[in-house]
């Protein structure tokens, strides 16, 4: 569908099926008015997953999508969703008529705003192009983390961006590790933040017509060393039928590098515990947190022998944490089972007797078993 002086779908009626997916080529600078549903019950317009506001240069209002003057960054997919039901009434892709890369949905407006460019546009003060990426104003992060602030903007002429820290020009020269400025992404990145990085960071975006600014607040949380934290309720007691597959999940949170082991409590010579009172366990899986799937224990094609108590044991340089759950395996022919499995136990410390030897990573730990 090639558009001419004004792109307009009229009247504002429910679209026919063939209207639901369209591709519109729009000339730069051209006004756009698209309708979706009846005016009083018009749908909501979205671009890139964000609902369009009822005011502004690009607006969604009473079922109508209005763009005063089509710019390159307006290209992309627009959805009109029915109120309440979220049914897609319109699925439109707007394409810049003379852009070499018209299929992209977030073209850089810069190339179309340069004075040398063959097109001429009215001057425009800077404006935020992706305000949804700026919603998080306060960044409270642990020391050592990476922090990224963004202020994506556009305007004509193309605006420049500079950064302030606590009101002063900020170039990062006094910061260990410096800073990373990506002007094309309108971003400031600081790696391995420290408490002295705390403060108010301001992006100042300006061109000959005007300027806009936005403040971010950074708080750096000093790490308090602690043993791993395991998410409550995981692993969860599970009931499975013979032959089925089971996944036991263990979510581990740790500042220091954690190591995880999955253990199965076993019986040796008719006993679950050794003479010293420590339980017998078999190490099923061991790895560090960065290993694939370490937080999930997969049991394939389970049999009655797989029933029992399983423990997720996580340790770091500070200490150990563990949580346990019970797996109950039912025979295939028994479709109903109502008895409750024992509650998972959450305890602080643990020492395991093991038939195969715990990993070296735990050998330095002083672990005691407390029922």
């Amino acid at each position: 569908l090639e558009a001419s002086e004004e792109v307009e779908l009229e009247p504002c009626l429910a679209p026919s099926l063939e209207q639901q997916e369209q591709e519109l080529t729009v000339a730069l600078g051209q006004p756009v008015r698209l309708c979706c549903g009846r005016a009083e019950r018009g749908g909501h317009w979205y671009k890139e997953g964000s609902r369009l506001a009822p005011a502004g240069r690009v607006r969604g209002w009473r079922g109508r999508l209005e763009i005063a003057s089509f710019l390159p960054e307006d290209a992309g997919r627009y959805l009109c969703l029915a109120r309440g039901s979220m049914i897609v009434l319109q699925n439109l892709t707007l394409i810049t008529g003379d852009s070499l890369t018209s299929s992209n949905d977030d073209e850089d407006p810069k190339s179309h705003r340069d004075p040398s460019n063959r097109h001429s546009y009215p001057q425009q003060a800077p404006y935020w192009t992706h305000p949804q990426r700026m919603e998080k104003k306060l960044h409270a992060v642990p020391a050592g983390n990476t922090v990224k602030f963004r202020c994506p903007a556009a305007g004509n002429p193309t605006p420049t961006i500079r950064w302030l820290k606590d009101g002063q020009a900020f170039h990062g020269e006094n910061r260990i590790g410096g800073i990373r400025l990506r002007h094309q992404h309108w971003s400031l990145v600081m790696e391995s933040v420290v408490p002295s990085d705390r403060g108010t960071y301001t992006c100042l975006v300006e061109n000959a017509v005007g300027s806009i600014r936005y403040n971010y607040l950074l708080d750096v949380l000093e790490r308090s060393p602690h043993r791993p934290i395991l998410q409550a309720g995981l692993p969860a007691n599970t009931t499975a039928v013979v032959g089925s597959d089971v996944e036991l999940l263990c979510k581990v949170y740790s500042d220091a590098q954690p190591h995880i082991q999955w253990l199965k409590h076993i019986v040796i010579n008719g006993s679950s515990f050794g003479a010293d009172g420590f339980p017998y366990v078999q190490v099923l899986k061991t790895a560090d947190i960065n290993s694939s799937e370490v937080e999930v224990l997969y049991l394939r094609n389970v049999s009655a022998e797989d029933a029992g108590e399983y423990t997720c044991l996580a340790g770091n340089s500070i200490g150990l944490s563990y949580q346990s759950a019970w797996l109950t395996v039912l025979p295939e022919e028994d479709p109903t089972w109502t008895a409750a499995a024992p509650e998972a136990r959450y305890t602080d410390k643990l020492e395991f007797r093991h038939d195969s030897g715990l990993n070296d990573i735990f050998e330095a730990q002083k672990i005691e078993w407390h029922e």
Epitope: N104, D106, T146, R182, H183
Partner: antibody, heavy 119, light 107 residues
Framework: QVQLLESGGGLVQPGGSLRLSCAAS????????MSWVRQAPGKGLEWVSV????????HYADSVKGRFTISRDNSKNTLYLQMNSLRAEDTAVYYC????????????WGQGTLVTVSS | DIQMTQSPSSLSASVGDRVTITCRAS??????LNWYQQKPGKAPKLLIY???NLQSGVPSRFSGSGSGTDFTLTISSLQPEDFAVYYC?????????FGQGTKVEIK
């Protein structure tokens, strides 16, 4: 349409050098940041380096820092990767990729060029 | 550097199945996460950018969700052409690290 075509791969001895090129067409090259991404045989993807559209910003993976240099010639619509002090672990298919504007997603990729470092 | 951990590393599924792949970052990365599909001998293909945005031309059965540290790629109804390796990639930090990949195989 957007096209990226890598060249310059081949067999090189450990300690040797190689220069990869990526010829771009179908878009305004200087408007886009470009990256190199590599993939060792049978392994996953590893990001190598990025350069901003005007060349004002570059960054490298720790594994190649000090050995590889990314550059571009916007007048020739070409991206380069100069690889020095090559090691066996640099053996991989090297892809050049274009970054989406406002994001660092690689929306277009070349077909790749194989670099083999072996004695 | 920020580490990305994908799970599972491989999975077997049938055509029509709903498939979910997860990716966890070692720190908060906001929504700076992309998903790619790669078939043998081919370059990767961008599916989802910035956690939840469907790349132009990608079928709507692919969707992404999550923010912070935990992200999910969902294929609502697996098609024969979807059997491939899937990678997540963070672009929050200057070094754009990838996950180790998830191979989706035919059951």
């Amino acid at each position: 349409q957007v096209q990226l075509l890598e060249s310059g791969g081949g067999l090189v001895q450990p300690g040797g050098s190689l220069r990869l090129s990526c010829a771009a067409s179908g878009f305004t090259f200087s408007d886009y940041a470009m990256s190199w991404v590599r993939q060792a045989p049978g392994k996953g993807l590893e990001w190598v380096s990025v350069i901003e559209g005007d060349g004002s910003y570059t960054h490298y993976a720790d594994s190649v820092k000090g050995r590889f240099t990314i550059s571009r010639d916007n007048s020739k619509n070409t991206l380069y990767l100069q690889m020095n002090s090559l090691r066996a672990e640099d053996t991989a298919v090297y892809y050049c990729a274009r970054e989406k504007t406002y994001s660092s997603a690689f929306d277009y990729w070349g077909q790749g060029t194989l670099v083999t470092v072996s004695s | 550097d920020i580490q990305m951990t994908q799970s599972p590393s491989s999975l077997s599924a049938s055509v029509g199945d709903r498939v979910t792949i997860t990716c966890r970052a070692s720190q908060d990365i906001s929504s700076d996460l992309n998903w790619y599909q790669q078939k043998p001998g081919k370059a990767p293909k961008l599916l989802i950018y910035d956690a939840s945005n469907l790349q132009s031309g990608v079928p709507s059965r692919f969707s992404g969700s999550g923010s912070g540290t935990d992200f999910t790629l969902t294929i609502s109804s697996l098609q024969p052409e979807d059997f491939a390796v899937y990678y997540c990639q963070q672009h929050y930090s200057p070094s754009h690290t990838f996950g180790q990949g998830t191979k989706v195989e035919i059951k």
